[in-house]
Interface confidence: low
């Protein structure tokens, strides 16, 4: 949660004249009470753009646009402080409109607008703008509140923002699936154009459950220029527990922007369909077994083994 | 070899649109961003906006949005930029030129244009 | 938006002489934490497609002759041909890619005397 970096901060508009300033979100009003306050903001509208920064990277912007209620007490509004705070992480950015001359009623309703806080993509945050000075206390509210979720990156705009692009958004691997004999999985994904080493995470879970029944991880080297681009297939062998047959596959890249970071992709195939009369399952036979530590499982004989090669 | 081919000149009537194309060859069309540049006659060059192939996002430069629209086609490697409600001041030539790398993820934003079309004459007249 | 201005609007140089025109933008173009100029010079011949010849203020572009070089920093860039040769007749354009809008310079028209 930042300001965009290079942009005049600008607030005057016909018959007011304004300026923008830093605040530490805590106005002197809170401290210093006035008596004659105004009231609140009538809309707030938020939406998001994308912006350049001073260096070119294309950055999430949230767009706050707000309009003033048509009473009395414009005539007391010295301004107004806006405020966005990131739900998860409690930060908070705050700016101030300071007003230099008075606000006057005039044939359009007044409206304000401030773009330059930048936003992370997949963020929740809370908007809130304050106008001054603030009421005092047990006085009637004159701020408005409205949260907004960013988009994450598989949002067509937020696809070319740097952060997102940063973190692999441009790489579709369009993985593909499928059950072959033997208990094995073969997985085919599309390797970006970057030298770099991707991991396959399989987990797999038992029909209708949500703790695992095995875990197997194979690493794929960086790919040579010329294999930028191709299919790469790999093979993976599953354990053979009945029952344990619904397999996520999932693809993590380290990408140089990203290194551990990047954004995986993940694909899923499910149980085939059940018969009927489902063939019992002995009741000594575990469907998971317990992990040891942080190793894999105890006996390396039950281990998923794997195979690949980059198809051209 | 490594080139941008436009398509050829256009005469429109005010109010209508127009829709100039071009070709990349000999160069991965989706790692670059495609920009559009137009020079009236005897004027400078101004830059109008660009788009990303990969994913069809557009940045437009201020006095253009809500005319221009940017396009892509990338099975056949070309972009395309449209203009609407024509006007006389919109007789111009219209270039297309590469810039911004995109190879790796960690893409380049730094738009210098290393590769131009030798631009479409676009004529605006009664 | 970040104006550009070009000094001279034309001049005319004998053959092997040096050419040097100057570019100035409203507002710096160096970004201090890379260092870098975010300017370009281009050349543009009749018909032809413009041509790149010097990005972040002073690396050529490959393929452009050393006669060719850039230098400056801030918001005052110079570009210099060393010796003119009769194919660099051409107007030539510095463009600032700091911020949106990019922005050009008006031209600068190259002639020989």
């Known amino acids: 949660l930042r300001l965009l970096d290079h942009r005049a901060l600008v607030c005057s508009q016909p018959g007011l004249n304004c300026t923008v300033k830093n605040s530490t979100c805590l106005d002197d009003s809170w401290i210093h009470p006035r008596n004659l306050t105004p009231s609140s903001p009538k809309n707030i509208y938020i939406n998001l753009s994308v912006s350049s920064t001073q260096h070119g990277e294309l950055v999430p912007v949230l767009h706050v646009e707000w309009t003033l209620q048509t009473d009395a007490s414009i005539l007391y509004l010295e301004g107004a402080e806006l405020s966005v705070l990131q739900l998860n992480t409690n930060e908070r950015l705050c700016v101030r409109f300071e007003f230099l001359s008075k606000l006057r009623h005039h044939h359009r309703r007044w409206r304000f607008t401030f773009s330059h806080f930048v936003v992370d993509p997949d963020q929740e945050y809370e908007v809130t703008v304050h106008h001054l000075p603030k009421p005092i206390p047990d006085g009637d509210p004159n701020h408005q509140s409205k949260n907004f979720l960013v988009p994450d990156c598989e949002h067509a705009r937020m696809k070319v923002t740097t952060p997102c692009m940063s973190s692999g958004s441009l790489w579709d691997p369009n993985i593909t699936v499928e059950t072959l004999e033997a208990h094995q999985l073969r997985v085919s994904f599309t390797l970006w154009n970057e030298s770099t080493h991707y991991q396959i995470l399989l987990t797999s879970f038992p029909h209708m459950e949500n703790h695992s029944c095995f875990e197997h991880m194979h690493h794929i080297p960086a790919p040579r220029p010329e294999e930028f681009h191709q299919r790469s297939n790999v093979t993976l062998t599953l354990r053979n527990l009945k029952g344990c047959c619904r397999h996520q596959v999932q693809i993590q890249p380290f990408f140089s922007s990203c290194l551990n970071d990047c954004l995986r992709h993940s694909a899923t195939v499910s149980c085939p369909e059940m018969p009927d009369t489902p063939e019992p399952i002995p009741d000594y036979m575990p469907l998971w077994e317990p992990r040891s530590g942080s190793s894999d499982y105890k006996d390396d004989d039950d281990k998923g083994s794997s195979h690949h090669h980059h198809h051209h | 070899q490594v080139q941008l081919v436009q398509s050829g000149a256009e005469v429109k009537k005010p109010g209508a649109s127009v829709k100039v194309s071009c070709k990349a060859s000999?160069?991965?069309?989706?790692?670059?961003?495609m920009h559009w540049v137009r020079q009236a006659p005897g004027q400078g060059l101004e830059w109008m906006g660009w788009?990303?192939?990969?994913?069809?996002?557009?940045d437009l430069a201020q006095r253009f949005q809500g005319r221009v629209t940017m396009t892509r086609d990338t099975s056949i490697s070309t972009a395309y930029m449209e203009l609407s409600r024509l006007r006389s001041d919109d007789t111009a030539v219209y270039y297309c030129?590469?810039?911004?790398?995109?190879?790796?993820?960690?893409?380049?934003?730094?738009?210098?244009?290393?590769?131009w079309g030798r631009g479409t004459l676009v004529t605006v007249s009664s | 938006d970040i104006v550009m201005t070009q000094s001279p609007d034309s001049l005319a140089v004998s053959l092997g002489e040096r050419a040097t025109i100057n570019c100035k933008t409203s507002?710096?173009?160096?970004?201090?934490?890379?260092?870098?100029?975010?300017l370009a010079w281009y050349q543009q011949k009749p018909g032809q497609p413009l041509n790149l010849l010097i990005y972040?203020?002073?690396t050529r572009e490959s393929g452009v002759p050393d006669r060719f070089s850039g230098s400056g920093s801030g918001t005052d860039f110079t570009l210099t041909i060393s010796s003119l040769q009769a194919e660099d007749v051409a107007v030539y354009y510095c463009?600032?890619?700091?911020?949106?809008?990019?922005?050009f310079g008006p031209g600068t028209k190259v002639d020989i005397k």
């Open positions: 788009m990303h192939p990969n994913s069809g996002g557009t």
């Open positions: 972040w203020a002073s």
């Open positions: 000999g160069y991965s069309f989706t790692d670059y961003y």
């Open positions: 463009q600032q890619y700091y911020s949106t809008p990019f922005t």
């Open positions: 030129a590469r810039g911004g790398y995109c190879s790796t993820l960690s893409c380049s934003f730094y738009w210098y244009f290393d590769l």
């Open positions: 507002q710096s173009v160096l970004y201090s934490s890379k260092n870098k100029n975010f």
